[in-house]
Interface confidence: low
């Protein structure tokens, strides 16, 4: 299927202009290749009318142009002074006309309606409100005011000042007569329906002295906005329906093959299971506008989406809607990354998160998708180092490997960690991605002691056992803090042939703290990695206590039971998208978690990867 995308159908009226926008994947080849607009003839050939190389056919001379926007991956064809002869089938495309990189566009130019002289034209979107103005002369001020709809040769009474209301307009129409001295009455019709379209007649008085005014009401279905997003990326639908529906339930639905509209998500708590873990409906602003974010875009997400407002939380005739046509480009710039990552209870996961490589300085975030009601995504960690309190010691966001990917490590896994997580930045919102963490049966590969109590001034050794399959990996210990995990200096890792042969004696990496100080208290991670790609980790908490004459006691790390203040990816989406520079804080509430102490440094801490015998015969 061609990745070029545009409007399937374009309609206009004689004498008017149209602007046709076509989208293409903005690869360097596509950005610089020829763009064209051609008309399909009976023979099947497509005759160029205008191209990006400056060609304009004689038929289009002086009334058409093609503008390329390579940075956006779009080009626009403007055609003015339309005539009925312009109706037909066209293609917008890249390269040569006969190649497949094109999109079919149907253009219909119709004759403008013949309206009686002095007709006022009202053009309003479906579901909106229109106010029809009806002037009258002083002598008709005390007489009956009415609005009729012309149907064929007859006129049907819609409303009058004697309190008649046509049943088709019940509960959505009112006639207003102003105070004395104002010679105009108005008819307000709310929640316009497509069937309201037509010619109306205002009348004041009767007989030969009556005042009449024609009004042509054009009720338009919303023109779908074309949205072109990359596979695996993210799309945001901003829905602004107006203050009049600010307190009405909102929804996003997708038009199906039967041309009905299936609810994707609504504010009443309904959500399509196909979007589980990858959709948020962000709370509405005071003006009633709201947005829906969908991540992890799939080809099957393509289609026409409508947002709207109705007390039932689904599409109903006569209520305002907005429309989008979503195209998902398979030639995606967003790299493939695992959508499901599996870990075992007690073990760890390392999640790779893509971001736009042009935005290496952007702030990185990781949040936990929560499905309750409209969905929300409380931030768990960010690249500035803030971590939610209940994740202290087991969550870290690393800038590595860089160049379009960052890493999030979560260890000490429990079944409660299963769920959907989002990777995002304060930069390009289209690069938001979703990953599902699943907790499966099994044992962690790395084994560390469950709890360690160190004595001030003495030496501490912490062993970390790893299996043969990690023998070729780089092993490390690091001290966890809010701002990351500071790798501790490593000693020589022993004879290399032991690792090649996976000698039984080579399956231990130990951390030595000598002498232990107060600053050494905190979380330590043992981990494996290959270059800048991180593998499994295991965490151990070191408590530091005074030297005792007899016995010792493990001091458990303090854990706050109270839920911390949360930063939540909901209303903050707008700030992310506005790319706030001065203060890229996304959310109103902030919790700065204090550092758990200085980084262990210098020669006091060392990592030794050697035989278990040398470490005092710890179990393997």
């Amino acid at each position: 299927k061609s990745p070029v995308f545009g409007p399937q159908e374009v309609s206009s009226v004689e004498g008017n202009s149209v602007s046709i926008k076509c989208y293409y994947p903005p690869t360097s080849v596509n950005r610089h290749t020829r763009k064209y607009w051609c008309r399909k003839g009976a023979s099947g050939r497509c005759i160029t009318l205008v191209s990006s190389e400056g060609y304009v056919s004689s038929n289009y001379a002086g009334r058409a142009n093609l503008t390329n926007f390579p940075e956006n991956g779009t080009f626009v064809v403007n055609i003015a002074q339309l005539s009925r002869d312009d109706s037909g089938h066209y293609k917008c495309g890249l390269g040569i006309n006969s190649r497949g990189l094109s999109f079919d566009v149907s253009l219909e130019v119709s004759q403008g309606p013949e309206l009686p002289n002095g007709t006022e034209v009202y053009t309003v979107d479906v579901g909106r409100t229109v106010t029809i103005k009806c002037p009258f002369k002083t002598e008709n001020a005390p007489k009956t005011k009415a609005l009729y709809k012309k149907i064929g040769q007859t006129s049907v009474l819609v409303i009058d000042s004697r309190n008649y209301v046509n049943p088709n307009y019940k509960d959505r129409i009112r006639l207003r007569i102003p105070g004395t001295g104002q010679l105009i009455f108005t008819v307000v019709i709310d929640r316009l329906r497509l069937s309201d379209h037509g010619l109306y007649l205002c009348q004041a008085g009767d007989g030969s002295n009556r005042d009449e005014k024609n009004a042509d009401l054009q009720v338009l279905e919303p023109e779908p906005e074309l949205v072109y997003e990359d596979l695996r990326g993210s799309v945001t639908f901003h829905c602004a329906l107006g203050l009049e529906v600010a307190n009405v339930a909102k929804f996003l639905c997708r038009v199906n093959s039967r041309e009905t509209c299936d609810v994707v998500i609504n504010t009443l708590g309904k959500r399509d299971s196909a979007f589980e873990g990858r959709i948020l409906l962000n709370p509405q602003d005071k003006d009633g506008s709201f947005s829906v974010v969908i991540t992890g875009l799939r080809k099957e997400d393509e289609g026409r989406y409508l947002c709207g407002a109705h007390s039932d939380g689904q599409l109903q005739e006569g209520w305002p809607i907005q429309a989008w046509q979503l195209f998902v480009n398979e030639e995606s710039t967003i790299p493939r990354s695992p959508t499901v990552v599996k870990g075992v209870a007690g073990g760890s996961v390392a999640v790779l998160c893509p971001y736009n490589p042009k935005e290496s300085q952007s702030l990185k975030y990781w949040c936990l998708w929560e499905g309750a009601q409209n969905g929300r995504c409380p931030l768990l960690v960010e690249s500035q180092g803030l971590v939610q309190e209940q994740y202290e010691g087991r969550l870290s966001l690393l800038q590595e490997p860089g160049n379009g990917t960052f890493t999030v490590i979560l260890n000490q896994l429990t079944t409660q960690d299963a769920g959907f997580y989002w990777c995002l930045t304060n930069g390009d919102t289209r690069w938001r991605t979703t990953v599902e963490i699943k907790i499966i049966e099994g044992e962690p590969n790395l084994k560390v002691p469950g709890n360690v109590t160190a004595v001030l001034g003495e030496t501490l050794n912490i062993p970390c056992h790893f299996p043969c399959k990690f023998s070729s990996y780089e092993k490390y210990w690091c001290k966890w803090s809010n701002t990351g995990c500071q790798t501790l200096p490593s000693q020589d890792e022993g004879p290399s042939e032991a690792f090649v042969n996976c000698d039984e004696n080579s399956r231990l990496v130990s951390l030595t703290l000598n002498p232990v100080t107060r600053a050494d208290e905190g979380w330590y991670w043992c981990g494996v990695k290959q270059g800048h790609f991180y593998g499994e980790t295991a965490a151990v908490y070191v408590a530091v206590e005074e030297k005792k004459v007899a016995g010792s006691r493990y001091v458990s790390p303090a854990k706050a039971d109270a839920a911390p203040d949360e930063k939540v990816l909901d209303s903050g989406v707008r700030e992310i998208e506005n790319k706030a520079i001065q203060d890229p804080r996304l959310f109103a509430e902030e919790k700065v978690v204090a550092d758990t102490g200085d980084q262990a440094g210098g020669s006091r801490a060392s990592v030794d990867s050697s035989s278990s015998e040398e470490q005092g015969g710890s179990s393997k």
Epitope: S11, P113, V255, R258, E259, T260, E317
Partner: nanobody, 123 residues
Framework: EVQLVESGGGLVQAGGSLRLSCAAS????????MGWFRQAPGKEREFVAA????????YYADFVKGQFTISRDNAKNTVDLEMNRLKPEDTAVYYC????????????????WGQGTQVTVSS
């Protein structure tokens, strides 16, 4: 206002063909999609096929499966339904409707209807 008049119905043997036509008159609008629906005795009116104003988008009900073809001629303001390999279960009154709404498969979004034309398929 749009007036719609269907024609072309009648009695036909199973396996035969019919071509229904719908003529639109009055104050027509270029943005109307046209649809065919049918209603068998004692059943609800069901969607058969629809065609966008430009003819660029065509929709068929699942049961059609290549049996029917919808087309339109905007110059003549007509929409036709070519019905082949007719079966007794295709017996119904066939209605032509017009809508400016994108949800062409749903009868409640149609603004105007014709009076219907009877199609009877005998076995």
């Amino acid at each position: 206002e749009v007036q719609l008049v269907e024609s072309g119905g009648g009695l036909v043997q199973a396996g035969g063909s019919l071509r229904l036509s719908c003529a639109a008159s009055g104050r027509t609008f270029s943005r109307y999609a046209m649809g065919w629906f049918r209603q068998a005795p004692g059943k609800e009116r069901e969607f058969v096929a629809a065609i966008a104003w430009s003819g660029g988008a065509i929709y068929y009900a699942d049961f059609v499966k290549g049996q029917f073809t919808i087309s339109r001629d905007n110059a003549k303001n007509t929409v036709d339904l070519e019905m082949n390999r007719l079966k007794p279960e295709d017996t119904a009154v066939y209605y032509c409707g017009s809508t400016r709404d994108p949800r062409v498969g749903d009868k409640k979004f149609y603004d105007y209807w014709g009076q219907g034309t009877q199609v009877t398929v005998s076995s």
